[in-house]
């Protein structure tokens, strides 16, 4: 069976094809090639010698138990390599030879037992090495890795490393790789020798599922000091064992390294305490708790020097009472519990993301709402109920604002935006809206993209709502249940690029709404019941038009609308997947494609 | 179509069939089965998929006595620091996994229970399996 | 056990043509991949040429227009002609056959 051209001459996908040896029927130029769950067995020398151009090899689960001296050699060009689930049990000491750019090598499952004899010294462009979920037991750092100064990524994860020495890390006394990219997380872990990361600089320490007991983690935690961590992760997974007992006394040590950003990632334990236990992490820049949960919400008050808190898919009791001066970005998304927002004071706070909590606001949105002047970005979508009461007083700086999937009510009895003359970005798109009042985007002067699909509006009629948003490059309108517009409609839209008016319930086409919109590049009329044209003579669309969508519409093919289906065939270089586009009516000519027609009148007569 | 038994349990009776080509080999084991009353235990799971496990979700289909329910979407891994810690598993890594589940005071009719798991995941998204689960419920009190 | 041996190399100067010629032992070489791989001291090597059992050929940008391999079945020999050498070509060329091993390399050297 022959491997699945995915990119003709560059990327091939011979998965599960029962391949013995390597395929050599493919271009010399193939670039990617995923030659997985094929029973390979052994790779001798030059093994991909027919692959001169190869960047990335995928060799997962071919059964290799030998690699030979040189198996790679020629692959020059090769930036990734993945052995993944392979049971090697003869690695020659020159198997990655040849590998000259090689950035990433995934040696996951491998059994490989050391780092000490696996044969990698001498890629120095390596950016990124998985050795996950194999039998290694120490975690001495092998001299080689001095030459590896590109590292980037080390994942030791779900081995067997039980203690780290001082001596283990000597390596990374002679070449601080400032980058570096730890993950230790499910290791059986039970001593880290105090002094073993004094004076270590790494980029991301990750330890989860690591401690079997508090005290294990206690002291494991006290031995990290010393440490310099851009970002720390601590916590454990929800499919493995947990600790049976969490307090303040875990994170401690935590005060004798210097973090920049911390994240706690799923805990199985009620946090009561958030002062106590996160004492040493008042001054970290970034700080945040996914899936945990929450029992007293007003210890977020605390004067806690966090620039930026991130509170994902965790539990409360209620709404969390928030109270942070310095901090300046908030997510708070996917979290269960207090339904309602109440009131946060954030004084500096520039990012709000208050998505996906099923949150219902009864008066929205001003700056008493969130306690600062200077936010720019405010993503409120996929919650419930939320009142329009105020137009953004206060919030003037806003720049992003995004409400999609939520329902918005009272947004046809005043101008709601009207303050937001900075706003470029607006996402009403699915909000229950039923747009009823022409002044509904006043003070919009620097809108750039208007997403307002799955909507509603008056006696299904657009009228002349978007006057004032003359830099508006992007709309789209789909979903609306539109059958009409006025002929106004787009006069001001001088710099749209892209209009989407899919999914509506037109039944005739007009140019004529579109001939100030001198930029536009894309007009989607697809899903429509588009018949025929309203006028019998249909003008040009603006000369900047390149797509055209007409698909999926209730064309006429009859004699009658023989003018409006030559005007179709003469946008044909404008027009998209025109094979989509079919006769409805009449019944003989259902489902032909409108462009293959030769429609000539006689022909009906 | 080739049947494969899950449990049987004093109320509920479980078992599944692919439903996609590939049919690559999934082992499922509950223990104890499923009691549609009530309910507690561990479910295993030992698969070796054929992509990144990377943003997992589920699509579920559910059919009770041939009404069908709205589709259901389960984001099981978001893409990093997931909850779960298969979400890390790469395409050809072993998966072997016990999760421990629980539900309670829900009252379920008499009758045949269908349910379409369609595993999507990666980047691009493909589906990584399909299985139809049916479960037969015969409450055994009211 | 797979033998390979090359012959033909020696110093020329810049501008003149060399023959390589490899003969393989222990194989028949009808349905092996074959090739020729070059390796300069303090350089990265490369292969020069390679040639599929249908007969189809692979040369990289820096020899295109002056090697040319061919390879003859019935005498278990594959060929390398180098034209218009340079200086650079100046290297230890190896017979590869992609997947069972190398010769030991025949010197080549040009001169100016």
């Known amino acids: 069976e022959p491997c699945v051209e995915v990119v003709p001459n560059i990327t091939y996908q011979c998965m599960e094809l029962n391949f013995y040896k390597i395929p050599d029927n493919l271009p010399f130029s193939t670039k990617n090639l995923d030659l997985s769950f094929n029973p390979l067995r052994h790779l001798g020398s030059y093994s991909f010698f027919s692959f001169p151009e190869l960047q990335v090899l995928d060799l997962s689960r071919c059964e290799i138990q030998t690699i030979e001296d040189g198996a790679y050699q020629s692959l020059s060009h090769l930036s990734t390599l993945i052995l993944t689930g392979n049971p090697i049990q003869s690695l020659a000491l020159g198997a990655f030879s040849g590998l000259s750019s090689l950035q990433k090598l995934v040696a996951v499952e491998t059994n490989l037992a050391s780092l000490e004899n696996f044969p990698i010294g001498h890629l120095k462009t390596l950016k990124e090495l998985n050795v996950a979920h194999n039998l290694i037991q120490s975690f001495k750092l092998p001299e080689y890795f001095s030459n590896l100064t590109n590292l980037e990524h080390l994942d030791l994860s779900s081995n067997k490393i039980q203690s780290i020495y001082c001596t283990d890390l000597r390596v990374l006394h002679q070449m601080p790789l400032l980058n570096l990219s730890l993950d230790l997380s499910l290791n059986p872990m039970n001593f880290i020798q105090p002094g073993a990361f004094k004076e270590i600089r790494l980029h991301k320490l990750t330890l989860r599922n690591n401690f079997d007991s508090l005290n294990v983690m206690k002291t494991c935690i006290q031995g990290l000091a010393g440490l310099e961590v851009h970002r720390l992760v601590l916590g454990e997974f929800r499919n493995e064992g947990n600790l049976e007992k969490f307090d303040k006394s875990a994170l401690e040590g935590l005060c004798n390294l210097t973090i920049e950003e911390f994240r706690l990632a799923y805990l199985d334990y009620y946090l009561d305490d958030i002062i106590d236990l996160f004492n040493c992490l008042t001054n970290v820049s970034s700080f945040s708790l996914v899936s945990v949960t929450i029992e007293r919400v007003k210890d977020f008050s605390y004067n806690f020097g966090w620039q930026h808190l991130e509170l994902v898919n965790c539990k409360f009791g209620q709404f969390p009472t928030l109270k942070l001066k310095s901090l300046k970005r908030l997510t708070f998304t996917s979290n269960k519990g207090g339904n309602a927002f109440s009131e946060v004071d954030l004084p500096s706070l520039e990012f709000l993301d208050l998505s996906r909590n099923g949150l219902s606001f009864k008066g929205c949105c001003s700056q008493s709402d969130f306690g600062t002047t200077s936010l720019k970005y405010l993503d409120l979508s996929f919650n419930g109920v939320i009142t329009m009461s105020s137009n953004f007083l206060g919030l003037e700086q806003l720049e992003h604002l995004d409400f999609q999937h939520s329902n918005l009510k009272q947004m046809s009895e005043f101008s709601v935006f009207l303050s937001l003359r900075n706003l470029i970005y607006l996402d009403i798109s699915h909000t229950h809206t039923r747009v009823a009042f022409n002044g509904i985007f006043n003070g919009l002067s620097s809108l750039e993209v208007l997403k307002m699909a799955g909507n509603s509006f008056q006696e299904n009629f657009l009228p002349d709502i978007f006057t004032e948003l003359r830099n508006l490059t992007f709309l789209d309108l789909s979903q609306c249940q539109l059958e009409q517009l006025s002929p106004t409609a787009f006069n001001s839209l001088s710099s749209l690029q892209v209009l989407n008016m899919s999914h509506n319930n037109f039944f005739s086409l007009d140019t004529f709404p579109y001939k100030c919109l001198n930029s536009l590049q894309v007009l989607d009329y697809s899903l429509n019941h588009i018949m025929t044209s309203k006028k019998q003579e249909l003008q040009h669309f603006p000369s900047s038009l390149a797509f055209l969508n007409l698909t999926q519409n209730d064309f006429a093919c009859t004699c009658e609308h023989q003018s409006f289906l030559q005007w179709i065939k003469d946008q044909r270089q404008l027009l998209v997947e025109v094979e989509r586009m079919e006769c409805a009516t009449p019944s003989d000519k259902q489902g032909m494609p409108v462009l293959s027609l030769n429609i000539t009148c006689q022909m009906n007569k | 179509q080739k049947q494969y038994w899950v449990c049987n349990s004093s109320d509920a009776s479980i078992s599944y069939t692919y439903c996609d080509k590939m049919q690559y080999p999934i082992s499922i084991n509950v223990n104890p089965c499923i009691e549609l009353k009530r309910s507690k235990g561990l479910l295993h799971i030992f698969y070796i998929p054929r992509r990144d496990l990377k943003q997992l979700y589920f699509n579920l289909y559910i059919t009770v006595n041939t009404m069908n329910l709205p589709k259901r979407k389960e984001v099981i891994c978001r893409g990093s620091d997931d909850d779960y810690s298969f979400c890390r598993a790469l395409k050809g890594e072993t998966v072997n996994t016990t999760i421990s589940f629980s539900f309670k005071g829900i009252k379920f009719s008499k009758g045949k229970y269908k349910c379409v798991v369609e595993a999507i995941s990666g980047s691009p998204e493909e589906m990584l399996f399909c299985l139809e689960f049916v479960i037969l419920h015969q409450p055994n009190s009211n | 056990e797979v033998q390979l041996v090359e012959s033909g190399g020696g110093l020329v100067q810049a501008g003149e043509s060399l023959r390589l010629s490899c003969v393989a032992s222990?194989?028949?070489?009808?349905?092996?991949?074959m090739g020729w791989y070059r390796q300069a001291p303090g350089k990265q090597g490369e292969s020069v040429a390679i040639?599929?059992?249908?007969?189809?050929?692979y040369y990289p940008d820096s020899v295109k227009g002056r090697f040319a391999i061919s390879r003859d079945n019935a005498k278990n020999t594959v060929y390398l002609a180098m034209n218009s050498l340079k200086l650079e070509d100046t290297g230890v060329y190896y017979c590869?056959?992609?997947?069972?091993?190398r010769g030991q390399g025949t010197q080549v050297t040009v001169s100016s």
């Open positions: 590869i056959i992609a997947g069972r091993g």
């Open positions: 222990g194989i028949s070489i009808s349905t092996e991949v």
């Open positions: 040639i599929k059992t249908d007969g189809s050929t």
